[in-house]
Each structure stands twice: as C-alpha cells, then as structure tokens.
C-alpha cells in the first residue's frame, strides 16, 4: 500500500461510541473530505499495555462508517487508543486517532419498544437482547415517559437483574378516548444527557373495558 502524505489530521474525523441495543458501536464522520474513501480499516491498542495496533477483524477494509466493538472492548475503565485509516483503492488517504474511555465517552441509545393502547392503560413492550454482557450494563435505568395534553410523567420501572430479554410495563389509570404518547430511554447514574426515543402515540379507545388494568398486570 502506498502512503501519500495524509491530507487529514486527527481533527478531520469525528468519532462517536454508542451503546446500541447493548452493543458497543463506534461510528465516524469525515470533515472537509475532498476524496471520499472507498473503504476503512479500524485498529486499536490499549494504553495500559501498549502493544502493536491490532486490526479489528470485522472492520478491516470495510465500506461502512461504523464498527461493532462489543467483543473487542470489554473494559469501561481502560483507555482504548484507536486509529482509523481511510483508503481510496490502494492509497491511504488519511489516518485519524482518538482515545476512548467507555465510562466517559459512551452514549446510550434508547431501546426498541412497542406500545398497545387499551381503554385505560397502555402496555409498553421494551425489547432488550437476550444476553447482555455484565460490563455493558453501565448502571443504567430504564425510563418510560408518558405524555398527554402537555403533561409529562416519568416512570422508572424496577427491572430485576440484568436488562435482558423482553420487558413489559403497564402505564395504568389512564383516561379513555385520550391521546397518549410514550418515549423510552436509558438513564445513567450521573444523569448525563440522555437520548430519548421518538414518541410513539396511541388514541385510547372510548368506553368501558371489562378487563381492568389491575387484572392485566
């Protein structure tokens, strides 16, 4: 591979590490790129034991601008020294580096969820992966926000054990024939900025429902 003098410094790449469906996903964007790379290779090492940079297997010569590092980055405390190389054909266009600490840099994307409206309650079904690595739990708590007619109520369901498998929460004591919107997100113990899901809304049916919210529980 030929190595032209890179026309991008570290400042030319913006990195983001996110917990998406409890997987560690590193994504990147390029600034001021005159030539768009045809592919990327991601390498890293751990600062505490600086060995040669290791190529991330599933992110070698990739055309995607993200990389799943769940199986590579297992510690929230370690500093991961990361290098992204961008190529056009056999020519290296640039090399960007950045250091990550998952405990500091990780942002938490909201889980997938569905809602089903009944006369006086809403079932919120939150989808978690079947298995979540212990180190990716991050002291997170699930928050379900219910909105109606400008009033926002926060629900913090208690989840026994790890956030894994599907989880159903019932928002009850609701008013029939009323529009309700629901958002879910993961909140960190230090109340750092959260990423809320888009709202999902439902108009509850009118009239009496024989089955009460209590028996639905």
């Amino acid at each position: 591979i030929s190595y032209d003098s890179p026309d991008y410094t570290d400042e030319s790449c913006t990195f983001k590490i996110s917990l998406r469906n409890f997987r560690s996903i590193l994504s990147w964007e390029l600034k001021n790129h005159s030539i768009v790379p045809t592919h990327y290779t991601l390498l890293y090492t751990i600062m505490s034991k600086p060995e040669d940079l290791k190529v991330v297997k599933n992110c070698a010569n990739t055309t995607r601008s993200f990389c799943d590092l769940t199986d590579e980055w297992r510690s929230t405390h370690e500093a991961y020294v990361t290098v992204l190389e961008g190529f056009s054909g056999n020519t290296t266009l640039f090399s960007c580096s950045h250091n990550f600490w998952l405990a500091i840099d990780m942002s938490f994307e909201p889980p997938e969820f569905e809602i089903v409206g009944f006369t006086n309650h809403i079932n919120v079904m939150v989808k978690f992966p079947s298995i979540v690595e212990e180190e990716l739990q991050f002291d997170l708590s699930l928050v379900i926000e219910e909105q109606s007619e400008g009033i926002v109520k926060k629900h913090k369901p208690e989840i026994k054990g790890n956030m894994s498998g599907n989880f159903t929460y019932i928002i009850d004591k609701l008013i029939p024939n009323t529009n309700y919107c629901v958002s879910v997100y993961l909140e960190h113990s230090d109340e750092q900025a959260v990423i809320k899901s888009p709202l999902k809304c439902t108009l509850l049916p009118p009239g009496q429902e024989s089955e009460s919210a209590e028996s639905a529980k």
Epitope: D10, F15, M47, S48, R74, S75, T76, H77, E78, A79, V81, H98, N99, F100, W101, A103, I104, D105, E134, E135, D139, S189, D190, Q192
Partner: antibody, heavy 119, light 112 residues
Framework: QVQLQQSGAELVRPGTSVKVSCKAS????????IEWVKQRPGQGPEWIGV????????RYNGKFKGKATLTADKSSSTAYMQLSSLTSDDSAVYFC????????????WGQGTSVTVSS | DVVMTQTPLTLSVTIGQPASISCKSS???????????LNWLLQRPGQSPKRLIY???KLDSGVPDRFTGSGSGTDFTLKISRVEAEDLGVYYC?????????FGGGTKLELK
C-alpha cells in the same frame, strides 16, 4: 515532564461564580482525561467530575451537577472548571489531575487552587 | 456511593520502623473486567498530592520499594517497611471501580 499548572487563589462573593484553570504541559493534552477534585480543610477529597479533552465528553458526580461546569480548550491545552452560585460550602482547595491508562487513576495532580467564598 | 473507611486516623511512627494503613470499602472493588481500581496517594504539607500505588499493588515510577499495596475485594492495606522522614504526610485511598469515585478520610503519618 508532565505538569498541571492551576490558576491562583480566589476570594469571591457569595452568589457569584469562579472559573479555575488547569494548564497541561509535557504530554499530549487530548490523549488523557482530566479529573477535578474538591478538598475542604481536614476532610478527604471529593470527586467532582471528569472530561475527555479529545471528545469534550464529561461525567459529573451527581452531587456537583449544576454546581460545576467542566470545559477544555485543545488549542491552549487548558482545562477549566466553573463553579456557580457560590456559597460558603464551596470554600475549598480544588485540584485538577490527569488520568493515564484508567478512568479514575489520577497519576499527576495540579498544585491546587484555593477558593474562598466570603462576603 | 461506595464508602471508603481508613484506619487509623493518625499513625505516630519512629523513623526506620514499619507502618501499616488499612482501607475498607463498603462494597467489593473488583470490576467486571477483572481489575480492582484501588489507589493510594500521599499529600505532604503544602504540596500537590502524589499517587503512590494504583490497581491495589502497582507502584508508580519513582516510588521507593519500601511501599507495598495489597488486598482484594473490600479490604486493602498500604505498608511501609521502614518509614523515612519524606514519608510523613496524609495518605488517602480511593476507588475508581464504582461511580462516583470516592476517597477515604485520610491517615496522617506523623513522628512519634
């Protein structure tokens, strides 16, 4: 060699704010975390928060959220901590420290900045 | 928050004699990555704090080998085999395993 040079002592009025600086030298500023710690006389230190100067990402101790604001200026290799709505409880020595290798490992410390809140 | 309890509060020693400081945490400091993020620092009067030990037992460069750190789980110890005058000051343990990081109340090492 690694050095963290903090700004000088401050005497400030209650209700005002103060900005403490921490200038790093002897290493690549954006490659390491900067932590901030509060120490009142005769007490153990309290952790305020941490910033990654490379990304600008921050984590605060919930106790100091809304009280402390951490920032970093890459061009001058300087980290800042602003303390707002000061009361006598904020009178303390504030330290910045560098993290190498691990979050929370704080291998080099600044000399401390004394903040006295008094009317 | 994890509570770090140091004993004794004050330790009066003779130069050349050994010293031992205990640090106990309210919950285990063993992280899911297999490491224990327990550190020790020394604060001499009028000086910046100086880290001595990290990851329970790893000595920082320039720290004399008369210092040793040991322990696991919730119980940790800092030992000085033969105290020298430059060792006097306040010693703090702190943990970085759990959020937020927390410090012990300190142990003052002074001359008898």
């Amino acid at each position: 060699q690694v050095q963290l040079q903090q700004s000088g002592a401050e005497l400030v009025r209650p209700g005002t704010s103060v900005k403490v600086s921490c200038k790093a030298s002897g290493y690549a500023f954006t490659n390491y975390l900067i932590e901030w710690v509060k120490q009142r006389p005769g007490q153990g230190p309290e952790w305020i928060g941490v910033i990654n100067p490379g990304s600008g990402n921050i984590r605060y101790n919930g106790k100091f959220k809304g009280k402390a604001t951490l920032t970093a200026d890459k061009s001058s290799s300087t980290a800042y901590m602003q303390l707002s709505s000061l009361t006598s409880d904020d009178s303390a020595v504030y330290f910045c420290a560098r993290d190498a290798y691990y979050v929370g490992a704080m291998d080099y410390w600044g000399q401390g900045t004394s903040v006295t809140v008094s009317s | 928050d994890v509570v770090m309890t140091q004993t004794p509060l004050t330790l009066s020693v003779t130069i050349g004699q050994p010293a031992s400081i205990s640090c106990k945490s309210s919950q285990s400091l063993l992280d899911s990555d297999g490491k224990t993020y327990l550190n020790w620092l020394l604060q001499r009067p009028g000086q910046s704090p100086k880290r001595l030990i990290y990851l329970v037992s790893k000595l920082d460069s320039g720290v004399p080998d008369r210092f040793t750190g040991s322990g696991s789980g919730t119980d940790f110890t800092l030992k000085i085999s033969r105290v020298e005058a430059e060792d006097l000051g306040v010693y703090y343990c702190w943990q970085g395993t759990h959020f937020p990081q927390t410090f012990g109340g300190g142990t003052k090492l002074e001359l008898k």
